[in-house]
Structures are given as structure tokens and as C-alpha cells.
Interface confidence: low
């Protein structure tokens, strides 16, 4: 069953997903989609990375962590009730049927009080700094060698709800861990 995450209308939602590259720069393509993970790829893609960079994103979806280090957690800004549903984080490990798929259920609750306009809200007010302990930016655009020997050591997603308010690193450590190879 999917792990459930909650956010209120008008706030930012955070859907955690991590992997550990075997070596810095040995990045793995990742896609995020709305809807449960299909057999291949992601349906209704909202954000995609390749071996070098973020190559597709839409305005309210971005990576709040440093995906050079494998933090591909998705932030959805200014959520509405329509954002409720299943989201797929797919880590596209080279090789046949090697992909790791994580389905995360986002539940959007009506706002308890009328929020201030979200575009004027400081991010730290909606999400304390403890959830964003690392920077976020694009991957290195260096030329990579053949990818099949990436040999990922760990892929993990989180089984804790956002409201647990733990450090992102602590959350990562508490997530499910899968070792490859």
C-alpha cells in the first residue's frame, strides 16, 4: 500500500524519495508522475531528471533537495484539492526491469483558516528549515561513462508522514532501504 502524506490547501506538499549514487556524478534518471507507477516510465509526468540535469519540470513542481546526492524529493507548491492522489517516484536504474518504483499518496485537506497569499509566504513559514537541510540545484553536466556499471548501493523512500517534522537526513535513514546487486 502507498505511504500517505498530508498537506493543507494553499501550502506546499513534500513527497520524499531518495537514492544513493554509487559515486558522485553517477546519476540515475528519475521521473515523477501523477498516478500510480505503470509498468514502464511515469504517467502524467510532472518532473524528470536525466543523467545530467533536470530536463523537464512544470511550474509548481520542483526538487527541494540536492539531487546530485540522490535527493529527488518532490515539492508541490500551493496545493489544491485537485492535487490529491497517488504520485509515482520512479528511479530508472539501467538494465531490464531494474527500476525502483515508489507510490506515494498525497491527501490534501481543506485549510483550517484562510491562508495569506502563498506567493507572499516565506517558504520557511510553511515548511521549517528542518525539512530543507540541503540545497537544491541541477545535476552536473559532465560527460558520464556507460551507465550499467553504476551499481547503486541504496534506494530508499520514506515511510514517515511529513508532519513528523524530522530532519530530512533522519527521515532518509528511517526509510525503506533496498540494496542492489
Amino acid at each position: 500500500s502507498e505511504v500517505e502524506y498530508r498537506a493543507e490547501v494553499g501550502q506546499n506538499a513534500y513527497l520524499p524519495c531518495f537514492y544513493t549514487p554509487a559515486a558522485p556524478g553517477n546519476l540515475v534518471p528519475v521521473c515523477w508522475g501523477k498516478g500510480a507507477c505503470p509498468v514502464f516510465e511515469c504517467g502524467n509526468v510532472v518532473l524528470r531528471t536525466d543523467e545530467r540535469d533536470v530536463n523537464y519540470w512544470t511550474s509548481r513542481y520542483w526538487l527541494n533537495g540536492d539531487f546530485r546526492k540522490g535527493d529527488v524529493s518532490l515539492t508541490i507548491e500551493n496545493v489544491t484539492l485537485a492535487d490529491s492522489g497517488i504520485y509515482c517516484c520512479r528511479i530508472q536504474i539501467p538494465g531490464i526491469m531494474n527500476d525502483e518504483k515508489f507510490n506515494l499518496k498525497l491527501v490534501i485537506k481543506p485549510a483550517k483558516v484562510t491562508p495569506a497569499p502563498t506567493r507572499q509566504r516565506d517558504f520557511t513559514a510553511a515548511f521549517p528549515r528542518m525539512l530543507t537541510t540541503r540545497g537544491h540545484g541541477p545535476a552536473e553536466t559532465q560527460t558520464l561513462g556507460s551507465l550499467p556499471d553504476i551499481n547503486l548501493t541504496q534506494i530508499s523512500t520514506l515511510a514517515n508522514e511529513l508532519r513528523d517534522s524530522r530532519l530530512a537526513n533522519d527521515l532518509r535513514d528511517s526509510g525503506a532501504t533496498i540494496r542492489i546487486g
Epitope: 511550474s59 530543507t132 540545484g137
Partner: antibody
């Protein structure tokens, strides 16, 4: 071709307010984080504030926090900086700048020509 | 006072190379590969030269190169030309999600 055009600068007394606007064209405004950067006369560049592509996330330099508010209107392709409680040290040319992507770490690949703000009695 | 330090000025002869340093801390320059460099000609807006430490922006010649070691980033301009005379700024994303510019360096081409 990316174009950014600032407006709204001028002379204002200490404690006063100004609203700067930046009209953007030549790119899909809704997909890029945007920032304001200023440059005092004869001085270097100083980052002022940034806002994400979706408009829901913003950051401010300590020197302007609580006084300035950044916002964006994607329908009008406009970036706005509302400046209140202005101080003489806010005197500078204010540049609107576009990030390479919707990520805070990115460099600024396009800049406007700037608008002058002078705070003086 | 900028938290990221650059030499106020450097100079070089046409055809030669010059390097501008950008010294920060583990919370900015040393934090990740997030350093960018800008050129500002007199009376003009800044122009992006380098991003992510070493990647040249679109249209920037390979005479401009960037690197980083620890908390120090460097911009090297080889084959100096008279039109390279300008102010150069490094900038870095910070671990607190802010952004910081270096104090700037004026390059004089002798």
C-alpha cells in the same frame, strides 16, 4: 529572445514605499524562478530576493526581510517587488534577473537593465 | 561587507591569462557545486559567464573557465582581450537557501 524590463524606480523619502515591476517576455515565465538583485552606487551586486516559478516560495536577504515583498503575476508575465519602510541604504539600481531553471542554486542567465531607486530626504 | 571575498582588482596583458579568486566558507562556496560568475561592463547589466562552478553559459567563449577547490572558486580568463576589461563577480548559493555575491573584482587589461 529573453527580455526583462524594470520600472517603478524613483526618488522616495526615508520610511516611504515603492513598487518595482519587471515585465518579462521571450520565455515561459511560469517555469522559471526569478530574483531581484541590487547595486548601490559604486558598489558590488547584492542579492535581494527570489521567488519560485510557482510563486509559492520566496526568500529574502536579511537586510530587507520584513520590509520587502516579492511576488509574481504569471498571467501578466510580471515580477513585482513591494518595498516598504525604505532606508537610505536601499538606494541602488535594482535588477530583475531570471534563473536558469526553477532551482535556487542556479545562476542568473538573463538580466534587465535596472531601475534606479533613491532614498533621500 | 561581503561574506565572499574577491580581490578588488587584477590586471593582465593582452594575450595572457589572469585568474580571479573567490574565497568563501563551507556554507556558501564550499557547500556544493553552485558557484556562478558574472561580467559587468561599465553602465551595463551583469552577464552570466559560468554556472555550476565550471559550465560556460550559452555563447561564452572557452577563454573563460571556472574551477573550485574547497572553499575557493576561481575564474580564469586566457588570451586576454581589451574588451575583457570589466568588473567580475562570483556568486554562490548558500546552505540557508539564500544567495551571496562576492565583492567584485575589476580586471584591467594593460
Amino acid at each position: 529572445q529573453v527580455q526583462l524590463q524594470e520600472s517603478g524606480g524613483g526618488l522616495v523619502q526615508p520610511g516611504g514605499s515603492l513598487t518595482l515591476s519587471c515585465a518579462a517576455s521571450g520565455f515561459f515565465f511560469s517555469s522559471y524562478a526569478m530574483s531581484w538583485v541590487r547595486q548601490a552606487p559604486g558598489k558590488g551586486l547584492e542579492w535581494v530576493s527570489s521567488i519560485s516559478a510557482g510563486g509559492g516560495t520566496s526568500y529574502y536577504a536579511d537586510s530587507v526581510k520584513g520590509r520587502f515583498t516579492i511576488s509574481r503575476d504569471s498571467a501578466k508575465n510580471t515580477l513585482v517587488l513591494q518595498m516598504n519602510s525604505l532606508k537610505p541604504e536601499d538606494t541602488a539600481v535594482y535588477y530583475c534577473a531570471k534563473k536558469r531553471q526553477n532551482f535556487w542554486s542556479e545562476g542568473y542567465d538573463s538580466w534587465g537593465q535596472g531601475t534606479q531607486v533613491t532614498v533621500s530626504s | 561587507h561581503s561574506a565572499v571575498t574577491q580581490p578588488p582588482s587584477v590586471s593582465g596583458s593582452p594575450g595572457k591569462a589572469v585568474t580571479i579568486s573567490c574565497v568563501g566558507s563551507s556554507s556558501d562556496v564550499g557547500y556544493g557545486d553552485y558557484v556562478s560568475w558574472y561580467q559587468q561592463l561599465p553602465g551595463m547589466a551583469p552577464k552570466l559567464l559560468i554556472y555550476d562552478v565550471e559550465k560556460r553559459a550559452s555563447g561564452i567563449p572557452d577563454r573563460f573557465s571556472g574551477s573550485k577547490s574547497g572553499n575557493t572558486a576561481s575564474l580564469t580568463i586566457s588570451g586576454l582581450q581589451s574588451e575583457d576589461e570589466a568588473d567580475y563577480y562570483c556568486a554562490s548559493y548558500r546552505s540557508d537557501s539564500n544567495f551571496v555575491f562576492g565583492g567584485g573584482t575589476h580586471l584591467a587589461v594593460l
